[in-house]
């Protein structure tokens, strides 16, 4: 008997949907695996007899249910296969969306960018799927515990009157509000500002 | 492409170091923050040390302070993590994450796949 694939789990980020397992304990030797999705009531191979135990369904559609699985093999016999559901747009994490940063004087200017979603156009991203697509920032005085939110109505933000000559740091995530779901934060880009550029009385 | 390859994961006695080193390579313009994580499987991923390119300035997360040095190496775009006095509860894949700029002014997450590193005792 052949047991099935184990820890069967979706890994989606930003819609790059792969479907990940772990090869069982097996002593008659290498097992090989086949993974298939439903379309239209028949599952069809989508990685057939791979020695991989990951699967790329980045090319199902982004919305309704699907049901995958896999299953183990050695030789002419096979495990029971392993099912799972999953919805793209409901399941996929929201990954970290891009920023740039430009320091002028006592200001920080930033603007964020969408994740890119892979497998789509150059220019299609998270936010042409969601509607509600906004973002949180936060940023702080470097070395300082105290961190301070901001939700900017648009695709830029400008912080002004910062101490000068300190580094301020700053990340981005993607929200949706109607869903209540929040994207993974950025890694921090940190800038110093440089002179206040008001001249005194 | 921009990648993030970590190494100097593996196995060792409670008590004793390691150091885990993460290289970037491809066509970057510059680095302005790299960090170090770990995640147990089952668990929330968790922020260990971060570390401001430029400068060198570094923050930890207080369940490392004093244990672990995020350090790095500017002509090698590489960033290290020295773990010392290492226990079991410190076993974990450990990830390291960047914010990278392929063109000027425009930032981007990178994270690598994972080390291992395990501390029996």
């Known amino acids: 008997m052949v047991p099935p694939p184990e820890n069967v789990r979706m890994n989606s980020v930003n819609f790059k949907n792969i479907l990940q397992w772990e090869s069982p304990a097996f002593a008659k030797g290498n097992l090989t695996f086949t993974a298939q999705y439903l379309s239209y009531r028949i599952f069809q191979d989508k990685c057939m007899n791979t020695t991989l135990t990951e699967c790329d369904f980045s090319s199902l559609s982004k919305y309704g249910d699907h049901t995958l699985r896999v299953r183990a093999e050695f030789a002419d016999e096979h495990s029971d296969w392993v099912n799972i559901t999953f919805c793209p747009v409901d399941d996929t994490i929201i990954g970290p969306p891009g920023m740039q940063v430009e320091v002028l004087a006592d200001s920080l200017h930033m603007r964020f960018l969408a994740p890119k979603i892979e497998n789509e156009y150059e220019t299609w991203t998270m936010k042409n799927v969601y509607n509600s697509w906004t973002y949180n920032v936060q940023y702080w005085k470097n070395g300082t515990d105290e961190k301070f939110q901001i939700t900017p109505q648009y695709d830029f933000e400008v912080l002004r009157n910062l101490e000068p000559w300190t580094t301020y740091c700053v990340q981005v995530r993607g929200f949706l509000p109607d869903r209540n779901k929040a994207g993974e934060w950025s890694e921090p880009v940190c800038e110093q500002t440089t002179h206040d550029e008001t001249v005194p009385s | 492409e921009v990648q993030l390859v970590e190494s100097g994961g593996g196995l060792v006695q409670a008590g004793g170091s390691l150091r885990l080193s993460c290289a970037a390579s491809g066509s970057f313009s510059s680095i302005s923050t790299m960090a170090w994580y770990r995640q147990v499987p089952g668990k929330q991923r968790e922020w260990l040390a971060r570390?401001?390119?430029?400068?060198?300035?570094?923050n930890y997360a207080d369940s490392v302070k004093g244990r672990f040095t995020i350090s790095r190496d500017n002509t090698k775009n590489t960033m290290y993590l020295q773990m010392d006095r290492l226990t079991p509860e410190d076993t974990a894949a450990y990830l390291c994450?960047?914010?990278?700029?392929?063109?000027?002014?425009?930032?981007?997450?990178?994270k690598s796949q994972g080390t291992q590193v395990t501390v029996s005792s």
């Open positions: 994450s960047g914010a990278i700029s392929q063109t000027r002014g425009t930032f981007w997450t990178y």
């Open positions: 570390i401001i390119w430029s400068s060198g300035a570094t």
